[in-house]
């Protein structure tokens, strides 16, 4: 009689994570008598997956009734597959004895596990940066298998080219991670911009995963200042305004100085928003010129988002205005939050 052969018809099987894997194995003879065992891997480090004779293997079930005497089908099903189950599985016939001894092995079936990448997480720089600066964004996704994966970067729908991507580990692994760093040059119009990291993988059926970062969390647009003198509202009173334009984020503090001395400090509250997402704000100061003998230097000083203050000055000519006798203090009315339409 021809010697028993162990036949594993499938060289490879690919299964999605969470599904069951069926590993086929048949023998060509009932002799010699003895059990079948399934192993993952070969050599001393091989793992026992199923022993027909004894043991508890909760995730493994036999496809046919392997306990029947005439049974020659020893295929198994492994439930709830994870990337850690990947490897080559061997169906091995043992000869009955004390103890049972290994008789013949099948050629092996390689099980590969398809696992979806996690949702890409995009993170930007820790500190805000100003327009014309280059900032880095990172994108990470984990737990996918097989290793082949495609990652693209976009800014407002336009594909970026300045990025570097690594897939780890380099060698064989049950699952993989991808890490990419993209460089983005900021512009003044980027408050509403988005950076998108797009990951495509065989498990996603052509529907890539996306991670986004809003540049509003990264950009700082410094304000431009303009100090102007408005027409005289009343006798001896001059209205000076400080226009603070095109700034982002909103966090801003304004200080008026008269000849270098602090006159008033206020925080931007009712701002107007421009189409590009930046803000405008206006503060005004009513100066009683009759209280001044000499010309007055008025300074609008702005501290934006914790940055060093910027300022703009305006010289108010006192000589051009008649002095009010007996008055030596400047009675000021101040106002702010005037709406300014552009």
């Amino acid at each position: 009689e021809e010697e028993l052969q162990v036949i594993q018809p499938d060289k490879s099987v690919s299964v999605a994570a969470g599904e069951s894997a069926i590993l086929h194995c048949t023998v060509t003879s009932l002799i010699p008598v003895g059990p079948i065992q399934w192993f993952r891997g070969a050599g001393p480090a091989r793992e026992l997956i199923y022993n027909q004779k004894e043991g508890h293997f909760p995730r493994v079930t036999t496809v046919s009734e392997s306990t029947k005497r005439e049974n020659m089908d020893f295929s198994i099903s492994i439930s709830n597959i994870t990337p850690a189950d990947a490897g080559t599985y061997y169906c091995v016939k043992f000869r009955k004895g004390s103890p049972d001894t290994e008789f013949k092995s099948g050629a092996g079936t390689e099980l590969s596990v398809r696992a979806k990448p996690s949702a890409p997480v995009v993170s930007g720089p820790a500190a805000r940066a100003t327009p014309q600066h280059t900032v880095s964004f990172t994108c990470e996704s984990h737990g996918f298998s097989p290793r082949d994966i495609t990652l693209k970067w976009f800014k407002n729908g336009n594909e970026l080219s300045d990025f570097q991507t690594n897939v780890d580990p380099v060698g064989e692994s049950v699952s993989y991670s991808i890490h990419s760093t993209a460089k983005v040059v900021l512009t003044r119009e980027d408050v509403h911009s988005q950076v998108i990291c797009e990951v495509a993988h065989v498990t996603l059926q052509g529907d890539p995963l996306r991670g986004t970062a809003n540049l509003s969390e990264t950009i700082r647009v410094p304000p431009t200042l303009e100090v102007t003198q408005q027409p005289v509202r009343a006798e001896n009173q001059v209205n000076v305004t400080c226009q603070v334009r095109k700034f982002y984020p909103q966090r801003l503090q304004l200080t008026w100085l008269e000849n270098g001395n602090v006159s008033r400090t206020e925080t931007a509250s009712t701002v107007t928003e421009n189409k590009d997402g930046t803000y405008n704000w206006m503060s005004w100061l009513l100066v009683n010129v009759s209280a001044h003998r000499d010309d007055v230097k008025l300074t609008c000083q702005v501290e934006h988002d914790g940055q060093p203050a910027v300022s703009k000055s305006h010289d108010l000519k006192v000589s051009a205005h008649p002095k009010e006798q007996g008055s030596n203090t400047a009675a000021e009315n101040t106002g702010s939050n005037e709406r300014n339409i552009y």
Epitope: F39, G43, P44, A45, E47, L48, P99
Partner: antibody
């Protein structure tokens, strides 16, 4: 009680070969992989390779392929290792140990032979 | 190959002291790690298998643990016979690799 009895000290000339033995007793020889480990003078341990007595399946550390050859005689429950083309680098103590026929945690390298000292000298 | 980086390579300690030896695995080995003890005469004995399981006959002052890729052998209350060499071994994948060893010396 499981025991491994290794052959005695060997003094050998460079370029020659030595064959050492490890006789197992106290359990079923065919249910285990027999492993060999090298320890150079004042050095650490290095795994050389292993043999499975049932079918003479062998697995080697790449560093020792062509240098060491593992064999078994199941009828006497004895494992052998031949080290060829000897140089001073091969002067070491060689140990035998075992693991179960599959990766069973409790059975990895529990029992060790006493070691065979090989000295290579002209 | 999986590298096992063992530290320290030597350690001086006093009787009764508590010491810890560490092995770091360069790749994932799960819990497949042994700790071995080698006497000056060359005799090798396994103390711990599967990271933290104590072999029978090994005193309870020996214990094994894991934190990520770092595996530790702790001896609490050193006794005179403990001042020998110790090795870790990974048996997750071939080639099976040992740490460089730690020589435990009496202070």
């Amino acid at each position: 009680e499981v025991q491994f009895q290794q052959s005695g000290t060997v003094l050998a000339r460079p370029g020659t070969s030595v064959k050492m033995s490890c006789k197992a007793s106290g359990s079923t020889f065919t249910s285990y992989w027999m492993h060999w480990v090298k320890q150079g003078p004042g050095q650490g341990l290095q795994w050389i390779g292993a043999i499975y007595p049932v079918n003479n399946d062998t697995t080697y550390n790449q560093k020792f392929k062509g240098k060491a050859e593992l064999t078994v005689v199941t009828s006497t429950s004895t494992a052998y290792m031949e080290v060829s083309s000897l140089t001073n680098e091969d002067s070491a103590v060689y140990y035998c140990t075992r693991s179960f026929y599959y990766s069973l945690d409790a059975a990895w390298f529990v029992y060790w032979g006493q070691g065979t000292l090989v000295t290579v000298s002209a | 190959d999986i590298q096992m980086t063992q530290s320290p390579s030597s350690l001086s300690a006093s009787l009764g002291e508590r010491v810890s030896l560490t092995c770091r695995a360069s790749q994932d080995i799960g819990s497949r790690l042994n700790w071995l003890q080698q006497e000056p005469d060359g005799t090798i004995k396994r103390l711990i298998y599967a990271t933290s399981s104590l072999d029978s006959g090994v005193p309870k002052r020996f214990s094994g643990s894991r934190s990520g890729s770092d595996y530790s052998l702790t001896i609490s209350g050193l006794e005179s016979e403990d001042f020998v060499d110790y090795y870790c071994l990974q048996y997750a994948s071939s080639p099976f690799t040992f740490g460089g060893g730690t020589k435990l010396e009496i202070n």
